[in-house]
Amino acid sequence: ESLGTEQRVVGRVAEVSGPEPSQQEQLVFGSGDAVELSCPPPGGGPMGPTVWVKDGAGLVPSERVLVGPQRLQVLNASHEDSGAYSCRQRLTQLVLCHFSVRVTDAPSSGDDEDGEDEAEDTGVDTGAPYWTRPERMDKKLLAVPAANTVRFRCPAAGNPTPSISWLKNGKEFRGEHRIGGIKLRHQQWSLVMESVVPSDRGNYTCVVENKFGSIRQTYTLDVLERSPHRPILQAGLPANQTAVLGSDVEFHCKVYSDAQPHIQWLKHVEVNGSKVGPDGTPYVTVLKSWISESVEADVRLRLANVSERDGGEYLCRATNFIGVAEKAFWLSVHGPRAAEEELVEADEAGSVYAGEQKLISEEDLGGEQKLISEEDLHHHHHH
């Protein structure tokens, strides 16, 4: 039994990985930031007269609130500017765009690439580094919901122009230290992390130095999760891989969920020569399926002695009673021919089904469960 409709013998899975455009864009800004909301006309057609509304009330333009037909700017944002913003057709009140804006007591959140903190020629002959925007560095705690983008900034100057580096919890912090990577915008003196997860919590220190001196600033990041929440997949995992015929491959998927998630490894397959069914949704087969009892699951799919048949598109999917998260990834197999034999570590291999109709199965996955190797699933139950 599943959370979907009754399972057919052969079925298809609807694409969940590429969600349709969100009806409400979630935006997080730091106190003091400029909030910029853009609402282009649908389909590029004429917009007609519009009105911007916050929490149900029309916005009154001011020196701080700049209102245009397709764009809204709120300068020097504060807590009071948090809320639900929408752009509506003036006559019909039809909502064209909808934004949820949250302004945090924090340096910044989100990658707005505003360029306003770019390095500048100070005109000073020589000098140790100094902060150019210290008023924007007062708030040292940034608390953002999981899956948001976070940006820390340390706008500085000096002569010669100082360098900037970043530490996490006192240790050098580089892109490879974080799944999903980081963006270092040296011109903006910023560190950007997309799709933050609980493991990103910690103290982030910018170190700005030149030959005349060094300054540093530490920010604390807390990643907030509502309980319960739908599963979150760590950004960047699983990663696409290329393998040589006959080699062994391992994929990683890191799942965060405080409500027992049903985790599945799936592979897109062909049925009667077709990759999709009559309704256009792709066929998949279940390679592995189990319930995780822990909040953080670092799960693995191992494919041994891969053959050309193992190449293709796979999915890591996590589902709980709130919702679904999934990530598609690819395996490319090439090179000298090896044995055609393939060994897939799978418990439901060959079971092709209507994936969205078997999104989660508390009932199926209950009852008899055997604990498989700790090395493989880190104490996750195997169905």
Epitope: E1, S22, Q24, I322, E356, Q357, G366
Partner: antibody, heavy 115, light 108 residues
Framework: QVQLQESGPGLVKPSETLSLTCTVS????????WSWIRQLPGKELEWIGH???????RYNPSLQSRVTISIDTSKNQFSLKLSSVTAADTAVYYC?????????WGQGTLVTVSS | EIVLTQSPGTLSLSPGERATLSCRTS???????LAWYQQKPGQAPRLLIY???RRATGIPDRFSGSGSGTDFTLTISRLEPEDFVVYYC?????????FGQGTKLEIK
Amino acid sequence: QVQLQESGPGLVKPSETLSLTCTVSGDSINSYFWSWIRQLPGKELEWIGHIYSSGSTRYNPSLQSRVTISIDTSKNQFSLKLSSVTAADTAVYYCARGASAVDYWGQGTLVTVSS
Amino acid sequence: EIVLTQSPGTLSLSPGERATLSCRTSQSISSGYLAWYQQKPGQAPRLLIYGASRRATGIPDRFSGSGSGTDFTLTISRLEPEDFVVYYCQQYGSSPYTFGQGTKLEIK
């Protein structure tokens, strides 16, 4: 903050179809499960069914032959249709987020089945 | 379907006391798929506990859940005046997902 709002007629005649719509605000309807639950006059809670944003559904077997739940992601709405109603279907109907257990509820709408 | 039986039907206690509400299921529930809700008059139920023991966001820590298999308990360590309402348990391990009949907590 996610908010759900039920809408639809409060009075339905016996043998007709009860139709309710739930509008979700504060978050996208995508990637979540959405449920209908009702509370009968005796305060008993009954799960009616749920739908995923892709359109897949699951219903309470006791109501399955009469229930249809649909979703319109472009409007951030999902709907309930219950056919061939009788007085026993008189209840407060809630829409909620979640497939089984639910974390956000609408305020509920009373539907009375009477001629 | 799985039948949930809550006891007692009504529990009379005083503010400051400890409340223990019981929920028994007719079949064992896998993986602790049990939730507790609080319902105030004229309002929708509110999720308190899920996964048998996990507190939902915003729920005071005086509320705790425990149990496994067929026997589950909601404990309110120190009753506040606003806690004297109705509580429901729900199993979501097997369809149809069913609720208990409720326990009414009243001021003695």
